[in-house]
């Protein structure tokens, strides 16, 4: 038994036929010693007398509000809730399995940007006697603060004969660092109480993995003279992180009729305009995704082909990013070839994802994960890799990136990747290895030495352990190269001489 909040206790029960249940001792919160009686809920039946009451809790009939009285006056209450465990698994009766992205997904979370603000939601078919309370933190062993509001009913839907209720909650990391590479996941814990049943649900994620931008705004069409083509332009959504030269998006532009089965014209671009063929009765849609990290695509923003007006959304500055005057070269060190570094780091992002594309289908955060991936270098908040830090002195950040590149280059050349099960030299991992080396050499020309970090001795003995470790390393590398790519893109746009 444990205390959920003041005067509310959760009794954990193994739930099987003829289970013995749990012995619970309740103590009346009073200085009084004599003449105390106990009742349950609205019943006037006296269950016992004395300052303590010992009960055997086996089923929901044994749970409820226990009240101690003296001479008709209520002294204190203790609400007992039951948390059922069947076959070693805690019950999940209150919330609906959303089955996306995988089975046993009860909580789903999304973030519109890297500010540390995110929304989680869940579904239930229960309409009454239902309460939720949400807690969150960054990391679990030494948790950093995340503040969550109250869960609210956000939608009601009819599903066949049933009504389905969606609840949501907004949370904000207290000291968010949008430009840093996350090393500890956000933990979200939801306590759910239905009548006398208690359940808890958890989710663990990095903000980068739950990013889903808002749709592009200000979609506009300009027909091209003597052509079937139209120029489509749009802007970054207002809610996306800034500056856009650092937090860049990529876009998918599609011209298609009302039915998904109709023929279409489709093109991908990093710019905020594109040229497509616009058929009568078709519409043009644009959606956005983080340019350097394969999180979710936004919903589509659409405009009909017939009119060449603009879609919903206010006007605002264009989202091509970059903007502003060119900034001075790096103080205290030579400036890197920003554009070359940008191209190579973007290639690294692509390679990192083709080397390990099945990211969403494998949950790598199980036992022992923190030890294996805490050893890899992360681009942290104080490393100067944010836009302001780069402007002040990019050398700190470049040195950190260089250390990471050398570290991962050595890891990819180590027994973890060269041992069984074997990889061929020109697999994406082989290309990744070569590109890491190439970028590190671009950053540190001959005769210029930065200190490098010691490689940890991660030598798994079993092939399956090696395979798991590879996935974890590649997963971590994807996050590292995404930050590096943002740094070089921003540098190329604002710091190139």
């Amino acid at each position: 038994i444990w205390e959920l909040k003041k005067d509310v206790y959760v009794v954990e029960l193994d739930w099987y036929p003829d289970a013995p249940g749990e012995m619970v001792v309740l103590t009346c919160d009073t200085p009084e010693e004599d003449g105390i009686t106990w009742t349950l809920d609205q019943s006037s039946e006296v269950l016992g007398s004395g300052k303590t009451l010992t009960i055997q809790v086996k089923e929901f009939g044994d749970a409820g509000q226990y009240t101690c009285h003296k001479g008709g006056e209520v002294l204190s209450h203790s609400l007992l809730l039951l948390h059922k465990k069947e076959d070693g698994i805690w019950s999940t009766d209150i919330l609906k399995d959303q089955k996306e992205p995988k089975n046993k997904t009860f909580l789903r979370c999304e973030a519109k940007n890297y500010s540390g603000r995110f929304t989680c939601w869940w579904l239930t078919t229960i309409s009454t006697d239902l309460t939720f309370s949400v807690k969150s933190s960054r990391g679990s062993s030494d948790p950093q603060g995340v503040t969550c509001g109250a869960a609210t009913l956000s939608a009601e839907r009819v599903r066949g004969d049933n009504k389905e209720y969606e609840y949501s909650v907004e949370c904000q990391e207290d000291s968010a660092c949008p430009a840093a590479e996350e090393s500890l996941p956000i933990e979200v814990m939801v306590d759910a109480v239905h009548k006398l049943k208690y359940e808890n649900y958890t989710s663990s994620f990095f903000i980068r993995d739950i990013i889903k931008p808002d749709p592009p705004k200000n979609l506009q069409l300009k027909p091209l003279k003597n052509s079937r083509q139209v120029e489509v332009s749009w802007e970054y959504p207002d809610t996306w992180s800034t500056p856009h030269s650092y937090f860049s998006l990529t876009f998918c532009v599609q011209a298609q009729g009302k039915s998904k089965r109709e023929k279409k014209d489709r093109v991908f671009t990093d710019k905020t305009s594109a040229t497509v063929i616009c058929r009568k009765n078709a519409s043009i849609s644009v959606r956005a995704q983080d340019r350097y990290y394969s999180s979710s695509w936004s919903e589509w923003a659409s405009v009909p082909c017939s009119g060449s007006g603009s879609s919903r959304g206010g006007s605002g500055s264009g989202g091509s990013g970059g903007g502003g005057s060119k900034l001075r070269a790096v103080p205290g060190g030579s400036s890197p070839a920003w554009t070359q570094c940008q191209q190579l780091s973007q290639k690294l992002c692509t390679l990192a994802w083709s080397a390990h594309p099945l990211v969403g289908h494998m949950d790598l955060r199980e036992e022992g994960d923190e030890e294996t991936t805490n050893d890899v270098p992360h681009i942290q908040c104080g490393d100067g890799c944010d836009p302001q830090g780069l402007r002040d002195n990019s050398q700190f950040c470049l040195q950190r990136i260089h250390q990471g590149l050398i570290f991962y280059e050595k890891l990819l050349g180590s027994d973890i990747f060269t041992g069984e099960p074997s990889l061929l030299p020109d697999s994406p991992v082989g290309q990744l290895h070569a590109s890491l080396l190439g970028l590190s050499q671009l950053l540190q020309p001959e005769g210029h030495h930065w200190e490098t970090q010691q490689i940890p001795s991660l030598s798994p003995s079993q092939p399956w352990q090696r395979l798991l470790l590879r996935f974890k390393i590649l997963r971590s590398l994807q996050a590292f190269v995404a930050v590096a790519a943002r740094v070089f893109a921003h540098g190329a746009a604002t710091l190139s001489p």
Epitope: R228, K263, V267, D270
Partner: antibody, heavy 118, light 107 residues
């Protein structure tokens, strides 16, 4: 399944015109874009243009503009490509292809060899 | 127009080995890049679309990667039926253009 069957080989004199046909089956003709791509002997692939059978819209590669005409007959589910003022370097295999997506080529015809020789 | 350059022009590989074919665009084309296989006397066949998307019915040994200006087609373990000419094609802008092709031959 989606199939494209092209007309037979042609031999033409320089300055003449050729009209190659491409009969589609296995799908609703107006549901796919149709492209023409050619390949000179021992050479690579060269895109010529596309037509939308639904409305007759066309887009031609600048190299062929003014010399090529693409048409369709929806009643027979057939596409045509006519190339005028033939030169010897127009000797090639001409392919039609169809796709629901405009910018790449999914289903190909078997090709029609056009030889331009005096 | 966008010029597509493929390398090498010829690649000699033994059956069972891995083949890596490169395609470079004269300007950034995002992921608007597609790969085709052509065997002698046959029409080309689409292998990969939008740089890395696989086509149903195409063996899993064919994979694509890249974005921007550099792209790669990888055949993980060459089978006898894979010896052919491979073309890349950009769809970033009209006119649509192809690379000159890479001939994969038996070593």
């Amino acid at each position: 399944q989606v199939q494209l069957v092209q007309s037979g080989a042609e031999v033409k004199k320089p300055g003449a015109s050729v009209k190659v046909s491409c009969k589609a089956s296995g799908y609703t003709f107006t549901d796919y874009y149709l492209h023409w791509v050619r390949q000179a002997p021992g050479q690579g692939l060269e895109w010529m243009g596309w037509i939308d059978p639904e409305n007759g819209d066309t887009e031609y590669a600048p190299k062929f503009q003014g010399r090529v005409t693409m048409t369709t007959d929806t009643s027979t589910s057939t596409a045509y490509m006519e190339l005028r003022s033939l030169r010897s370097d127009d000797t090639a295999v001409y392919y039609c292809n169809a796709n629901k997506e405009l910018r790449y080529f999914d289903v190909w015809g078997q090709g029609t060899m056009v030889t331009v020789s005096s | 127009e966008i010029v597509m350059t493929q390398s090498p022009a010829t690649l000699s590989v033994s059956p069972g080995e891995r083949a890596t074919l490169s395609c470079r665009a004269s300007q950034s084309i995002s992921i608007n890049l597609h790969w085709y296989q052509q065997k002698p006397g046959q029409a080309p066949r689409l292998l990969i679309y939008f740089a890395s998307q696989s086509i149903s019915g195409i063996p899993a040994r064919f994979s694509g990667s890249g974005s921007g200006t550099e792209f790669t087609l990888t055949i993980s373990s060459l089978q006898s039926e894979d010896f052919a000419v491979y073309y890349c094609q950009q769809s970033n802008s009209f006119p649509l253009t192809f690379g000159g092709g890479t001939k994969v031959e038996i070593k």
